[in-house]
Interface confidence: low
């Protein structure tokens, strides 16, 4: 039951980062014009990573797209990349991850399938959540280091000697996103990953040996001792030792060599 | 490299007018806004007036109904007309343009060299 908790849970978690990642990526505001000090009053300038926008205080706003690849700066460049990539991967462990779901039965998997599907979208997770947050940190770095070279030529520029200052940009709402769904995703890919070992079946170097009386089954396996009655919850004679995972009717595909009746 | 040339400054009497202009050159913008500021002998640089590629206009309070500010989109231009001129208008006029090229991530604050424009009897 826990297993299947920490699953969903991580897949819900995940889903929701993911969500997150794609909305910050598609968002305008990565870099928001600072407004400390900033003589134009009219207008608010802010971008994102397709397209920079201007803001008129009417309410009225205008969006331009980027619609050169070679002219751009690298580092936008990259974080593109790190965003899509973490996209991907993160759509791609969602449809992993909803076939590995303890709660959904596709034909015959076992359970050990299931298990390594979770560990695989577990790790996409991971990476994705990764992507994400080293893709924002990437681009709050270029504004930090933007931010404090266009307040240095801000001041020297004023005296009418220096005629270029860079407007100075400071974080926008999509970093913030960038890096809390970067976060869930991460959390959700640990949290599937963790399911993972709750789902794999336990491996012993003996085979448990199954004693069946009438009207009770006690199942012992090595390195402890569980028993339960026929009667009452475990009324389908369940083995305890893999957690309950298989009827008695599957004892037939792990012959032992001892059964006794 | 975007330039900006400004002209139409000079000497003229209390109540006169001019018409001041400013082009940009040396880009393609995705986005402009453009305008005047200001800067009398021993102040701070003060807005004058702006406008938006749309035709959005902003102004100074002082110069409300008496300055017009107006842009060519077609020639990246922007004009001041300014009339009922008074002395206290004496200033160095510097053209401004906020413009995002597409070669520019970040928006770049361009400055003229400006024009004196001096107001007296």
């Known amino acids: 039951m826990a297993v299947t908790a920490c699953q969903g849970l991580g897949f819900v978690v995940s889903l929701i980062g993911i969500a997150g990642i794609i909305a910050a990526t598609c968002m305008d505001q990565w870099s928001t014009q600072d407004l400390y000090n900033n003589p134009v009053t009219a207008v608010f300038n802010y971008q994102g990573l397709w397209r920079s926008c201007v803001r008129e205080s009417s309410g009225f706003t205008e969006c331009r797209g980027y619609f050169t690849l070679l002219g751009l700066p690298a580092m936008l460049q990259a974080v593109r990349a790190l965003m899509i990539v973490g996209i991907v991967l993160g759509a791609i462990g969602l449809l992993v991850s909803i076939f590995a779901l303890k709660c959904i039965r596709i034909g015959s998997m076992e359970d050990s399938a299931k298990a390594n599907m979770t560990l695989t979208s577990g790790i996409m997770f991971i990476v994705s959540g990764l992507c994400a947050i080293a893709g924002v940190s990437v681009f709050a770095n270029m504004l930090v280091t933007n931010f404090w070279m266009s307040t240095a030529n801000m001041y020297t520029g004023m005296g009418g000697m220096v005629q270029t200052v860079q407007t100075r940009y400071t974080f926008g709402a999509a970093l913030f996103v960038g890096w809390v769904a970067g976060g869930l995703t991460l959390i959700g890919g640990v949290m599937m990953c963790i399911a993972c070992r709750g789902l794999a079946p336990e491996e012993t170097n003996y085979k448990a040996v199954s004693y069946h009386a009438s009207g009770h089954s006690v199942a012992y396996k090595p390195g402890g001792f569980k028993a339960s009655t026929g009667f009452g919850s475990n009324t389908k004679n369940k083995k305890i030792y893999d957690g309950g995972a298989r009827t008695e009717d599957e004892v037939q595909s792990y012959p032992s060599k001892h059964d006794y009746v | 490299q975007v330039q900006l040339v400004e002209s139409g400054g000079g000497l003229v009497q209390p109540g006169g007018s001019l018409r001041l202009s400013c082009a940009a050159s040396?880009?393609?913008?995705?986005?402009?806004?453009m305008g005047w500021y200001r800067q009398a002998p021993g102040k701070q640089r003060e807005l004058v007036a702006t406008?938006?590629?749309?035709?959005?206009?902003n102004y100074a309070d002082s110069v409300k109904g008496r300055f017009t500010i107006s842009g060519d989109n077609a020639k990246n231009t922007v004009y001041l007309q300014m009339n009922n001129l008074k002395p206290e208008d004496t200033a160095v006029y510097y053209c401004?343009?906020?413009?995002?090229?597409?070669?520019?991530?970040?928006?770049?604050?361009?400055w003229g060299q400006g024009t004196l424009v001096t107001v007296s009897s």
């Open positions: 040396g880009g393609i913008f995705s986005i402009g806004v």
């Open positions: 406008i938006t590629s749309r035709g959005s206009t």
């Open positions: 401004y343009a906020d413009l995002i090229r597409p070669g520019d991530f970040y928006g770049m604050d361009y």
